[in-house]
C-alpha cells in the first residue's frame, strides 16, 4: 500500500527549497511535469516542462526551476528566495490538460517566515535542503536544534485535505525532525 | 537502532541473473529511499540507482537501464535489486544505502547495508 | 555526466597532522557535495553534507568548505583510526556521481 504523507518544509525568507518528486518512468517519461500551488479549491499551475521532456533541460519561471530526468523518473523543484507569501500546499503533477493533471506524491507544505534580524540579505543565496528524520520523536529531540536548522511536522492529529479536479487525497502528518543543511 | 541487513554472498555464471535484497528496520520505510551502490574490488564507489519504497517507483543510471530491476516488500521493509545478463566485469561489492526523505533533494547515504559480494565467473 | 575529480589519489602523513583532501566538479554543483569515508573491507560512512555539515557523531576534526566547483576536505589532526579511503560524491544533478578516491595511510 502507498502512504500519501505531507512533509513540512520551514524556511527563513530568501532561503532555497530543493525537493524532487518520482513518477513511474514507463507511463511518464515523456509527459509534461507542472509544479502547482493549491489555492483554495483550485489549483494554480506555477511552472511546467517542455514536451518531450529532456534530460536536463532545465525550465525557469521566475524564482522557479523545475528540471525533468525522464531517465531517471525524477523531476526536481527548485524555488529561490523565498518569500513568506509563498507559504501554502504545493505539489508535482503529471500535466495532460488544464483540467486534467494526475498528482505525484509527497505534497509540500512550504512555511516561509520572516528571518531574523541579521544582516539585510544575508540569507539570499542560503539553501535549507530537507535531510533525514533521526528516529527518535520531536519531543526528545526538539531542543536539541534550533531554527532555521529543524523543520517539524504538524502532530499526528492533523490531516489536509487537497482537493484536485475529480479527487479527493487526504495526507496524514507524521511528528518528526527533519535536519538541514544551511547554506550561506 | 536503524540499520540494513543485505542478503548473502553470490557466485554466478555469466549471462544469470542476481537478486540481492536489502532489509531495513528501526525507522519509517516508507519515508525514505534506498539506493544503489556498487565497488568492484580496489575501485571506487559506482551509483547504480534509486528507489522509493513509498510509490514503488525508481530509476537507474544509463548503462544498467534494462538489466537492473528495483522492487520492494513494504510488509517485510525489504528493497530488492535484480541485475540480470551478468559479465565479469559486474562482479563487485553491491551496497544498498538510505538516502534522504523521498521528497527532498538531498542525496546524502547516511546507512549503509554490509554489502552483498557478487562474483560473476564461468 | 559531472566528473569529480579528487587530488591526492594517496597520501602518508603523521599522527597529529593536519591533512588536505581536495575534490574538483567539472562544473558549478553549488553545495551539492557529500564526504564519506571508507575503512578496508566496510562500507562507506557519511562524514560530511552539504559541503561542511557535520554527521552526527562525527569527530569535530573532520571538516569541509567550499562551493561551486572546488572543495576541500580536512583532517585537523590525524589519528591512527582515520586510516581509510576518502570519498567526495555530487548531487547537484543526476546520475550522481562519486569522486575516484584518496586513500590515506599514515606514516
Known amino acids: 500500500t502507498t502512504e500519501l504523507t505531507e512533509e513540512k518544509y520551514e524556511y527563513k525568507e530568501g532561503q532555497t527549497l530543493e525537493v524532487k518528486c518520482d513518477y513511474a518512468l514507463e507511463k511518464y517519461a515523456n509527459s509534461r511535469k507542472a509544479w502547482q500551488k493549491m489555492e483554495g479549491k483550485m489549483p494554480k499551475i506555477l511552472a511546467k516542462t517542455e514536451r518531450p521532456s529532456e534530460n536536463s533541460h532545465p525550465v525557469q519561471v521566475g524564482r522557479i526551476t523545475l528540471e525533468d530526468y525522464p531517465d531517471h523518473g525524477l523531476l526536481q523543484v527548485r524555488m529561490t528566495n523565498l518569500q513568506v507569501e509563498d507559504s501554502g500546499l504545493y505539489q508535482c503533477v503529471i500535466y495532460q490538460h488544464p483540467k486534467e493533471s494526475h498528482v505525484l506524491f509527497n505534497p509540500i507544505c512550504l512555511v516561509v517566515t520572516k528571518g531574523s534580524s541579521g544582516t539585510p540579505g544575508s540569507s539570499e543565496n542560503s539553501t535549507q535542503n530537507v535531510y533525514r528524520t533521526p528516529s527518535t520523536t520531536a519531543k526528545a529531540l526538539g531542543p536539541r536544534y534550533t531554527s532555521p536548522r529543524t523543520v517539524t511536522q504538524a502532530p499526528p492529529e492533523s490531516t489536509v485535505v487537497v482537493s484536485t479536479p475529480g479527487s479527493e487525497i487526504n495526507l496524514t502528518n507524521v511528528t518528526d525532525i527533519i535536519r538541514v543543511p544551511v547554506f550561506n | 537502532q536503524v540499520q540494513l541487513v543485505q542478503s548473502g554472498a553470490e557466485v554466478t555464471k555469466p549471462g544469470a541473473s542476481v537478486k540481492v535484497s536489502c532489509k531495513a528496520s528501526g525507522y519509517t520505510f516508507t519515508r525514505y529511499d534506498i539506493n544503489w551502490v556498487r565497488q568492484a574490488t580496489g575501485q571506487g564507489l559506482e551509483w547504480m540507482g534509486w528507489?522509493?519504497?513509498?510509490?514503488?517507483?525508481?530509476g537507474s543510471v544509463q548503462k544498467f537501464r534494462g538489466r537492473v530491476t528495483m522492487t520492494r516488500d513494504t510488509s517485510i521493509t525489504t528493497v530488492y535489486m535484480e541485475l540480470s545478463s551478468l559479465r565479469s566485469d559486474d562482479t563487485a561489492v553491491y551496497y544498498c544505502?538510505?538516502?534522504?526523505?523521498?521528497?527532498?533533494?538531498?542525496?546524502?547515504?547516511?546507512?549503509w547495508g554490509q554489502g552483498t559480494m557478487v562474483t560473476v565467473s564461468s | 555526466d559531472i566528473q569529480m575529480t579528487q587530488s591526492p589519489s594517496s597520501l602518508s602523513a603523521s599522527v597529529g597532522d593536519r591533512v588536505t583532501i581536495t575534490c574538483q566538479a567539472s562544473?558549478?554543483?553549488?553545495?551539492?557535495l557529500n564526504w564519506y569515508q571508507q575503512k578496508p573491507g566496510k562500507a562507506p560512512k557519511l562524514l560530511i553534507y552539504?559541503?561542511?555539515t557535520l554527521e552526527t557523531g562525527v569527530p569535530s576534526r573532520f571538516s569541509g568548505s567550499g562551493s561551486g566547483t572546488d572543495f576541500t576536505f580536512t583532517i585537523s589532526s590525524l589519528q591512527p583510526e582515520d586510516i581509510a579511503t576518502y570519498y567526495c560524491?555530487?548531487?547537484?544533478?543526476?546520475?550522481?556521481?562519486f569522486g575516484g578516491g584518496t586513500k590515506v595511510e599514515i606514516k
Open positions: 562544473q558549478d554543483i553549488n553545495n551539492h
Open positions: 528507489m522509493n519504497p513509498n510509490s514503488g517507483n525508481s
Open positions: 552539504g559541503a561542511y
Open positions: 560524491q555530487q548531487y547537484d544533478k543526476l546520475p550522481l556521481t
Open positions: 544505502a538510505r538516502g534522504g526523505i523521498s521528497s527532498s533533494w538531498h542525496w546524502a547515504f547516511d546507512i
